[in-house]
């Protein structure tokens, strides 16, 4: 058993049918010695008397808010949560496996640049009685500071019969140098509590590996005289690291017909302009990627050909 | 120890070309190592990230773009934060700071070259003959060193008397390649920045 926060404790259980569970001793936080009784949650049934209460915690029915009283007055509370270990592996019931980029990916994180700011998000089908708290650091043995905000519900989607909820959190490394070569990964730890179930999820990454630039901005077309060709131009996104000559991007320009089946023409360039043939009803899209370290491509910025 | 926006020497552009070749070569070699050594811990998540140039060179700091010298986090890791004055920027010659940056890059390349050659000698003794260093990568390191045109005493190739542990050697190869790829990215950024300045 360990303390998650004041008066909230997590009991770790080897989870299998007929498991013996864990013996837990609760102590009433009071100078009083006599006349103390214990109850669980809203029930008035007295579970025991005395300054300490010994319980065998086996299932969720044994978890909850234990309260010690004296003469009708509440003295203190202890909330017991359960953390299930199933065959040596901690349970992952609360969050959905996003399966991207690989199986057992519960937390996904992205950064728009090298400033040390990043966003993480996760999915769940649970809508109520759910709380998250997020901590982060650079490295784990001698951790350096990363400050995270509160996790917020950022999107709701309908997936088949189920509703899916997306939560996200923004974090900022306290002292980040965009040019630094990372040798210690960022660690992100999410504590999730659903009713009386506790779970924790972690992700470990280098900022360089989670870079996804914003799409190029000010995408414009300039028709070339007496030609079906157009000059496409764009700019680096405002959120990208500067100077751009050091933090350079490479670009992919795509001409896509109205039908998804039509052949796509693609051009790769390090410049911020390109000459392409604009077909009728087609659209031109441009996306960006770090020129020197191949992390994710940005989303497409698009303009119609007409 | 930051990089001023100086007028580059005409010799800077070949360095950009060579540094791009270097990044391509080390990336290809790392990909090959990951595939060939699939039963070894060779992914970024599995290896310890070690920098053999740590405390020996200071490429990131010496080659810091001028725009980042205002960022305290980029300076506090250095023993001295050295902001060049205006007179340095006016110089038509490669400034003292740029020379410091390029010599630091040269020293990096020299250290990795020695490590890779020592490692290749061990890998050639492996009866499994599972993986060797790409000669193209070693050649590209050499080309960039020549383009940088610094003279420094040659470091003798390390020789080891004891029987090599091939498992450990292959894991060390992965560690080296990961670190060298990261340094090659920095070198490419620096050359691109100098080329644009």
């Amino acid at each position: 058993i360990w303390e998650l926060k004041k008066d909230v404790y997590v009991v770790e259980l080897d989870w299998y049918p007929d498991a013996p569970g864990e013996m837990v001793v609760l102590t009433c936080d009071t100078p009083e010695e006599d006349g103390i009784t214990w109850t669980l949650d809203q029930s008035s049934e007295v579970l025991g008397s005395g300054k300490t209460l010994t319980i065998q915690v086996k299932e969720f029915g044994d978890a909850g808010q234990y309260t010690c009283h004296k003469g009708g007055e509440v003295l203190s509370h202890s909330l017991l949560l359960l953390h299930k270990k199933e065959d040596g592996i901690w349970s992952t019931d609360i969050l959905k496996d996003q399966k991207e980029p690989k199986n057992k990916t519960f937390l996904r994180c992205e950064a728009k640049n090298y400033s040390g700011r990043f966003t993480c998000w996760w999915l769940t089908t649970i809508s109520t009685d759910l709380t998250f708290s997020v901590k982060s650091s650079r490295g784990s043995s001698d951790p350096q500071g990363v400050t995270c905000g509160a996790a917020t519900l950022s999107a709701e989607r309908v997936r088949g019969d189920n509703k899916e909820y997306e939560y996200s959190v923004e974090c900022q490394e306290d002292s980040a140098c965009p040019a630094a070569e990372e040798s210690l990964p960022i660690e992100v730890m999410v504590d999730a509590v659903h009713k009386l179930k506790y779970e924790n999820y972690t992700s470990s990454f280098f900022i360089r590996d989670i870079i996804k630039p914003d799409p190029p901005k000010n995408l414009q077309l300039k028709p070339l005289k007496n030609s079906r060709q157009v000059e496409v131009s764009w700019e680096y996104p405002d959120t990208w690291s500067t100077p751009h000559s050091y933090f350079s991007l490479t670009f992919c320009v795509q001409v896509q017909g109205k039908s998804k089946r039509e052949k796509k023409d693609r051009v790769f360039t390090d410049k911020t302009s390109a000459t392409v043939i604009c077909r009728k009803n087609a659209s031109i899209s441009v996306r960006a990627q770090d020129r020197y370290y191949s992390s994710s491509w940005s989303e497409w910025a698009s303009v119609p050909c007409s | 120890r930051n990089l001023p926006v100086a007028t580059p020497d005409p010799g800077m552009f070949p360095c950009l070309h060579h540094s791009q070749n270097l990044l391509r070569a080390v990336s290809n070699m790392l990909q090959k190592a990951r595939q060939t050594l699939e039963f070894y811990p060779c992914t970024s998540e599995e290896i310890d990230h070690e920098d053999i140039t740590k405390d020996k060179t200071s490429t990131v700091e010496a080659c810091l773009p001028l725009e980042l010298t205002k960022n305290e986090s980029c300076l506090n890791s250095r023993e001295t934060s050295f902001i060049t004055n205006g007179s340095c920027l006016a110089s038509r010659k490669t400034s003292f700071m740029m020379a410091l940056c390029l010599s630091s890059i040269y020293e990096d390349l020299k250290m990795y070259q020695v490590e890779f050659k020592t490692m290749n000698a061990k890998l050639l003794m492996d009866p499994k003959r599972q993986i060797f260093l790409d000669q193209n990568m070693l050649a590209v390191i050499d080309e960039l060193m020549q383009a940088l045109n610094f003279n420094s005493e040659t470091v003798p190739q390390k020789s080891s008397l004891e029987e090599p542990d091939f498992y450990k050697t292959k894991i060390k190869l992965c560690i080296l390649l990961h670190a060298f790829r990261i340094r090659a990215v920095t070198i490419d950024r620096v050359m691109s920045y100098l080329n644009a300045s």
């Epitope: 989870w15 299998y16 049918p17 199933e86 065959d87 040596g88 089908t125 | 811990p41 599995e46």
Partner: antibody
């Protein structure tokens, strides 16, 4: 004590369907994940499928994906395996088992796919 | 499709020490726990070892398990006639958990 009693096995022709049941008692069935494991005659153990305690997630071996469906009825304390498009290679003893460091197995039920 | 490899058979005389190996990889045994089962003819498998080296109550202490790196082993110290059975190791793969990965199985024969 924990008990898993299986039923539903038998002889079936290729291409036909069969449903296996596993009735649980002696524990809070709705709190635990459950597996199906099979063993072809004279062969080793092969995992077939898994279902979470609440039925929210199901996982299948590639060899049965799209043909077999694992399900549970927590109100009846029963686990099911619906097998469709059966093949000769599905002939085996099928076991249900609880998920956890200590597990409990059903007695097994024989499924024979033969024309 | 077996990723955990066991020797097909091992044998020993009563009182001898018999060991069965179970060889896997970094993504299974290397990063997950191992169980061992005993299966007597015509019966369901019986758990012998869980979490690499733990013995459930009721399992004789002549059975012991260990794990090192990407392999595990089961030792029967002082093998007895009633130990003649098939033995299976079981683990998970970190990418496909909770799918069970079983070993190929080992037939233990007690001679004489």
């Amino acid at each position: 004590q924990v008990q898993l009693v299986q039923s539903g096995g038998g002889v079936v022709q290729p291409g036909r369907s069969l449903r296996l049941s596993c009735a649980a008692s002696g524990f809070t069935f709705s709190s635990y994940g459950m597996h199906w494991v099979r063993q072809a005659p004279g062969k080793g153990l092969e995992w077939v499928a898994f279902i979470r305690y609440d039925g929210s997630n199901k996982y299948y071996a590639d060899s049965v994906k799209g043909r077999f469906t694992i399900s549970r009825d927590n109100s009846k304390n029963t686990l099911y395996l619906q097998m469709k498009s059966l093949r000769a290679e599905d002939t085996a003893v099928y076991y249900c088992k609880t998920h956890g460091s200590h597990d409990n197995w059903g007695q097994g039920t024989m499924v024979t796919v033969s024309s | 499709s077996y990723v955990l490899t066991q020797p097909p058979s091992v044998s020993g005389t009563p009182g001898q020490r018999v060991t069965i190996s179970c060889s896997g990889g970094r993504s299974n045994i290397g990063s997950n726990t191992v169980k061992w089962y005993q299966q007597l003819p015509g019966t369901a498998p019986k758990l012998l070892i869980y979490i690499n080296d733990q013995r459930p109550s009721g399992v004789p202490d002549r059975f012991s398990g260990s794990k090192s790196g990407t392999s595990a082993s089961l030792a029967i110290t002082g093998v007895q006639a009633e130990d003649e059975a098939d033995y299976y190791c079981q683990s998970y793969d970190r990418g496909t958990h909770p799918a069970l990965l079983f070993g190929t199985g080992t037939k233990v024969t007690v001679l004489g």
